[in-house]
């Protein structure tokens, strides 16, 4: 049995330009200790979308449902979506360290943007 699961329930999300997109992510355990970060794209060229501890992400808001008993919710909402936001978004769990070590990624959610 896996010690940690990172679950992105939606494979894809379609949003009209100008609207907000909610990207869902739940994690089965806080252990191992370490942060959750969101990225667009995979590999070395991926773009950091949200990191709770550092950086300025004015269009991104955490929208967790803290009532979830069996999982930790680390979902985000991106406001004022534009075509440039299209791509696949990954919720990634890190293990705390110096530096933090990437541990597990969700399967990804593809965001497509429709014309208004």
């Amino acid at each position: 049995e896996e010690e940690l699961q990172v679950i992105q329930p939606e494979k894809s999300v379609s949003v009209a330009a100008g609207d907000s997109a909610t990207l869902n992510c739940t994690v089965s355990s806080l252990i191992p200790v370490g942060p959750i970060q969101w990225f667009r794209g995979a590999g070395p060229g991926r773009e950091l979308i949200y990191n709770l501890k550092e950086g300025h992400f004015p269009r991104v808001t955490p929208v967790s449902d803290p009532t979830k008993r069996n999982n930790m919710d680390f979902s985000i909402r991106i406001s004022n979506i534009t075509p440039a936001d299209a791509g696949t978004y990954y919720c990634v769990k890190f293990r705390k360290g110096s530096p933090d070590v990437e541990l597990k990624s969700g399967a990804g959610t593809e965001l497509s943007v429709r014309a208004k």
Epitope: E1, E2, E3, L4, S28, S29, L30, I31, P32, V33, G34, P35, I36, L52, P62, V63, S64, P66, R69, N70, N71, M72, D73, F74, S75, I76, R95, K96
Partner: antibody
């Protein structure tokens, strides 16, 4: 019904060792993060150690790091705390605690008393 | 370490009245909208029992006269109305990413 039954407490001299055990039943032990929390009249509740569901990751506060070792046997539904180089300040009631998500301490055993004294 | 200051240390409240306990953390225990502060009840001779998880969520089987609120550094446990069986010591506990996890010093609730 969740049951956590601790054993192995007792009187030990400073510098000595003890091994605490916790027998779990009533839930899927291998899916739960497990911890030990201790309680002293003077210091209240103090987190002692935590282990991930599969046993890969362990965490300790500085007060016990290097002296205490937490392990688990999921096949036996058992949790173990090996305590070495015991000090008077380790005297406490030790509780075995289960946690579904590693966040809150969901279920507590009745505790076992450890006394470190010469 | 995140230090949790719990107040008051003891509290005497009349039956049927409201009891309010506060915990203040030395730094935020929030992450992604989750507040990693929890509340426990301990009666004499018994282990602690989880009442409220993540600041405001009532654990299954806990009466709804117990409620929790707060975020970031300031949290409150409210018992309303207080009943005789609520006489106990109450503890808060933070489980943020910042180790070690720590507890408040406890609040002993008695009947006035």
């Amino acid at each position: 019904e969740v049951q956590l039954v601790e054993s192995g407490g007792g009187l030990v001299k400073p510098g000595g060792s003890l091994r605490l055990s916790c027998a779990a039943s009533g839930f899927t032990f291998s899916s739960y993060v497990m911890s030990w929390v201790r309680q002293t009249p003077g210091k209240g509740l103090e987190w002692v150690a935590t282990i991930s569901s599969g046993g890969t990751y362990t965490y300790y506060p500085n007060s016990v790091k290097g002296r205490f070792t937490l392990s688990r046997d999921n096949a036996k539904n058992s949790l173990y705390l090996q305590m070495n180089s015991l000090r008077a300040e380790d005297t406490a009631v030790y509780y075995c605690v289960s946690s579904m998500t590693g966040s809150s301490f969901d279920y507590w055993g009745q505790g076992t008393t450890v006394t470190v004294s010469s | 370490d995140i230090v949790i200051t719990q107040s008051p240390a003891s509290l005497a409240v009349s039956l049927g009245e409201r009891a309010t306990i506060s915990c203040r953390a030395s730094e935020s225990v929030d992450s992604y909208g989750n507040s990693f502060m929890h509340w426990y009840q301990q009666k004499p001779g018994q282990p602690p029992k989880l009442l409220i998880y993540r600041a405001s969520n009532l654990e299954s089987g806990v009466p709804d006269r117990f409620s929790g609120s707060g975020s970031r550094t300031d949290f409150t446990l409210t018992i309303n109305p207080l009943q005789a069986e609520d006489v106990a010591t109450y503890y808060c506990h933070q489980s943020s990413e910042q180790l070690p996890w720590t507890f408040g010093g406890g609040t002993k609730v008695e009947i006035k």
